[in-house]
Every structure is written in C-alpha cells, then in structure tokens.
Interface confidence: low
C-alpha cells in the first residue's frame, strides 16, 4: 500500500492552518478549517491524529481551501492538521503538516483559578497583582469585585492567564474571575473561587489604632493636670508675698 | 493485483434509480479514492464524483450532484453509485476507477463499466 | 470549469508513422495532466500522468509533453495495438474535465 511519505522540511513548506468562527466553540457551531499554502496547491488535505488518509479532502487551484464542519458536535474536537500537495509530487507525497490546530468543542470552558501575587494580604501602600489563569491560550479574561455589578477589569490575553494590578489603597475585597473566547459565539468559563484581599495584620492595626488614640487622650488629660496642678502652685506662691496685714 | 468488479447491466424505467456496484479487491480499499466516470456512445469520458471510502468524504461535478450519491461499505471493500430520476441522458456505460495514489489522482485502475439503459 | 480542448478530434494514420495529439486547458493546469487510451468496449487505460510520466506497462513509444495550458501525447512508430480514442484530463480543481477526444484510426 501507498502510504504518505512527508518530504524535506524545506522541499514543500508547510501550510497554515485556521478556525472560523474560532477554535473554541459552542455544540452545533459550523465551523470551517482554513488551510493557507504558500504555493498553488491542487488537493488540501485535513488530517487528525492516527489516519492515514485525509479525513477530508478540497481541491482548489489556489493556495486556500476551506473545510466545512457543519453543526459541530464534542466528538469532532481535537487535533487537526492539514497538508497540500500536487500530482507531479509523485505518490502518497504531501507537503510539511501544518501546526497542529485543536478545536474545542464544549458548553462552558473549564473554571479558572484566581490567585493573588505575592499574597493575598496587602500593606496599605503597596499594589497587589491577581492571575486568572485558565487553561486556554487568546481568551479574555474578566475580573469581578463583590458588591461591583460591572466587571472591575478586562484583558485579552495571549498566555492562558491574565495579570490584574489593583491599588493597595483599594485592595481589600473579595474577588473573583472568568474567561470566555473573545469573539462570538462566546464560549463563557465557570466564574474562578472568590479570593479574598485583606490589609496587612489588620487585626493588630486596628487595636494599636485604638491605642494610639487612648495614649493621646490620655497624654492630653495628663497635660491638662499637669498644667492646673502648675497654675495652682504658682497662685498659692503668689498670694503669700502679695498680702499685706 | 488491483481489480475492480463492477455489478452487470441495467435496464431501468425512466424516473427510477439505479445502484451500480464496484468491489475493490487486491487492495486496502479505505487508502484510496474510487472516481466514477460516464461515457455515453459517441461522446467523451464525463468524470462524475469520488469518494474516500475511509471516510465516507465525497466530491461531486456539480452537473452531477443532484444526479449521482456516492457511497462505500467498507465490510465489503465496496463502492456504490446511485442514480435517481432517470432519464435517457443517463443512458451509459459508468465506470469506476482507483487513483495512483492513495489521495486521489490519475485514474490507474478502472472497472470493466457498467451499462445502464433507461427505456420505457 | 476548465475546458480542454483536444485536437485532432480524429487522424487517420498507417502504421509506423508518427502521431501527435494536442490538448489545451482553459487556464494554466502546471503539469496536472493524464493522457488515456480506450479502445471500442473497454474501460480507458491510462497513458502518462503529470503530463510527462509514462505509467507502469505503457510502451515508451509514448510520450507526453508540455505544461501550463499546452500539453501533447506523442506516439513513434505506431503500432496496431494503438488504434482506438485518446483522451487528456486535467487534475486542478474539480471537476476534473476531459478532452472530447481524438479518435486514431487506421488509414
């Protein structure tokens, strides 16, 4: 049997390999693979993992073919791949594969976690930076305050995670994030557990606080004391030297 | 060696179908393309459509889309061509054919054709 | 569509001579291009692929030439054997069309 044999690297560069509407989609999104050659082709090929044979195939006189997954369903995410080739390569000859494509085909995107850098606990001037890191690559990515409707702050993000700088000042809060692809039809995650955001010994600020004021008011009443106590000798050493018979 | 067996002659009412057969042999039949080809007396070869019997993918001449479904069972190492709402323009002899090549190209091995006669 | 146009549509030739059969595509093909041999009441055989290469058991008294939009069969010293109707084919974008055909007989 004749079976693929893949040239030189250099000899037939590989083709570029898309998704329409987006690589991450909801059940029952039609969706079209695009393969891109850099040459004029004459059969494209869509390969997944394993086969030997293109599971689909387009001829085109072009270097663009499109496959069309119609109504997609969770079984026809993976990994694909595409090829092109002409004739006159001889048989069973494709080009490089492209890079790998992975579609994923899902209801809701796996639930992100949401952790604080370095800590949950902030001094009152210093920032603090919370991840929401998901498990996909240039997704978007939102950030929610409890008790905030609005989402505090939003970041498309290349990296499976997203930074999001919060002022120490106003930091303390309970927090939580998400992720969703960043075209429709969006495909939104599960929102991340809250993450809490508290001063820097809280506790301890609060009571040295307080002391702080009790030492103040007392500083003042021993002040007031000592400057009556004052007044009063003074007056009584007056009196005597002042008074005649 | 390759052989492709193609089912006898057919003679059909006009307005039916007709389901002609190929069984590969001598092969791994889900490798490679079977192409379906008409020829009608005293005119040229027509390529029809092909499909890869590994994934049941097709690709149709879209003079023949509404004409010809193609399908395979690979149990029985098997192509089939259904033709429906006949007419005496479909009266031909249909051929099937194996690629080179396991992807599809240059028609190498060919059935003995199939005769189909559409006649009230 | 591209449309190959074939000529002679038919020659009349003895044997030993030399033939050659044109076939010229619609738009530029590059070399995707098969030449096939039928005779009366067989199925085609199949000459020459990718314009140029001669298939398994074909004699090398054929030869195919050309690429772009013109391409030739070319056939030396024609033997008995090779009376009967040529056909070229394109492969660059479906569908993949034939020539209407050159019909070679014996003069």
């Known amino acids: 049997d004749i079976t693929p044999s893949v040239p030189p690297a250099s000899y037939h560069p590989k083709p570029w390999l898309g998704a329409q509407p987006a690589t991450v989609v909801t059940p029952g999104v039609n969706v079209t693979l695009r393969c891109r050659a850099p040459q004029p082709a004459w059969r494209f090929g869509l390969f997944k993992p394993g086969e030997i044979a293109p599971l689909l195939f387009r001829d085109v006189s072009s270097e663009l073919a499109e496959f069309f997954l119609e109504e997609v369903t969770p079984a026809q995410g993976g990994s694909y791949r595409c090829c092109y080739r002409r004739p006159d390569w001889g048989p069973g000859v494709w080009s490089q594969p492209s890079d790998v494509l992975e579609l994923l085909v899902t209801e809701e995107l796996p639930r992100p976690s949401l952790v604080a850098l370095p800590g949950p606990v902030v001094g009152p001037g210093a920032n603090v930076s919370l991840r929401c890191a998901g498990r996909l690559r240039n997704m978007s990515f939102v950030l929610y305050r409890e008790g905030v409707a609005a989402p505090l702050q939003y970041r498309h993000s290349a990296q499976p995670w997203a930074d999001f700088t919060l002022l120490g000042a106003r930091a303390p809060g309970t927090y939580s994030c998400y992720y969703h692809t960043p075209s429709a039809p969006y495909v939104l995650s599960q929102r991340s557990e809250v993450l809490v955001i508290s001063w820097e010994d809280s506790g301890s600020s609060d009571y040295t606080r307080g002391n702080l004021v009790r030492l103040g008011l007392a500083g003042l009443v021993l002040i007031s004391l000592g400057a009556l106590v004052t007044f009063d000798w003074r007056s009584q050493n007056r009196a005597p030297a002042g008074i005649r018979p | 060696q390759v052989q492709l067996q193609q089912s006898g002659a057919e003679l059909v009412r006009p307005g039916t179908s007709v389901k002609v057969s190929c069984k590969a042999s001598g092969y791994a039949f889900t490798n490679y393309m079977i192409e379906w080809v008409k020829k009608r007396p005293g005119q040229g070869l027509e390529w029809i459509g092909v499909i890869n019997p590994g994934s049941g993918g097709t690709n149709y001449n879209e003079k023949f889309e509404n004409k010809a479904t193609l399908t395979a069972d690979k149990s029985s190492s098997t192509a089939y061509m259904q033709l429906s709402s006949l007419t005496s323009d479909d009266s031909a002899v249909y051929f099937c054919?194996?690629?080179?090549?396991?992807?599809?190209?240059?028609?190498?091995?060919w059935g003995q054709g199939t005769l189909v006669t559409v006649s009230a | 569509d591209i449309q190959m146009t074939q000529s002679p549509a038919s020659l009349s030739v003895s044997v030993g001579e030399t033939v050659t059969i044109t076939c010229r595509a619609s738009?530029?093909?590059?070399?995707?291009l098969a030449w096939y041999q039928q005779k009366q009441g067989k199925s085609p055989q199949l000459l020459v692929y990718?314009?140029?290469n001669l298939a398994d058991g074909v004699p090398s008294r054929f030869s195919g030439s050309g690429s772009g939009t013109q391409f030739s069969l070319k056939i030396n010293s024609l033997q008995p054997e090779d009376f009967g109707s040529y056909y070229c084919q394109h492969f660059w974008g479906i569908p993949w069309t034939f020539g209407g055909g050159t019909k070679l007989e014996i003069k």
């Open positions: 990718a314009a140029t």
């Open positions: 738009e530029k093909i590059y070399s995707n």
């Open positions: 054919a194996r690629s080179l090549d396991f992807d599809g190209a240059w028609f190498a091995y």
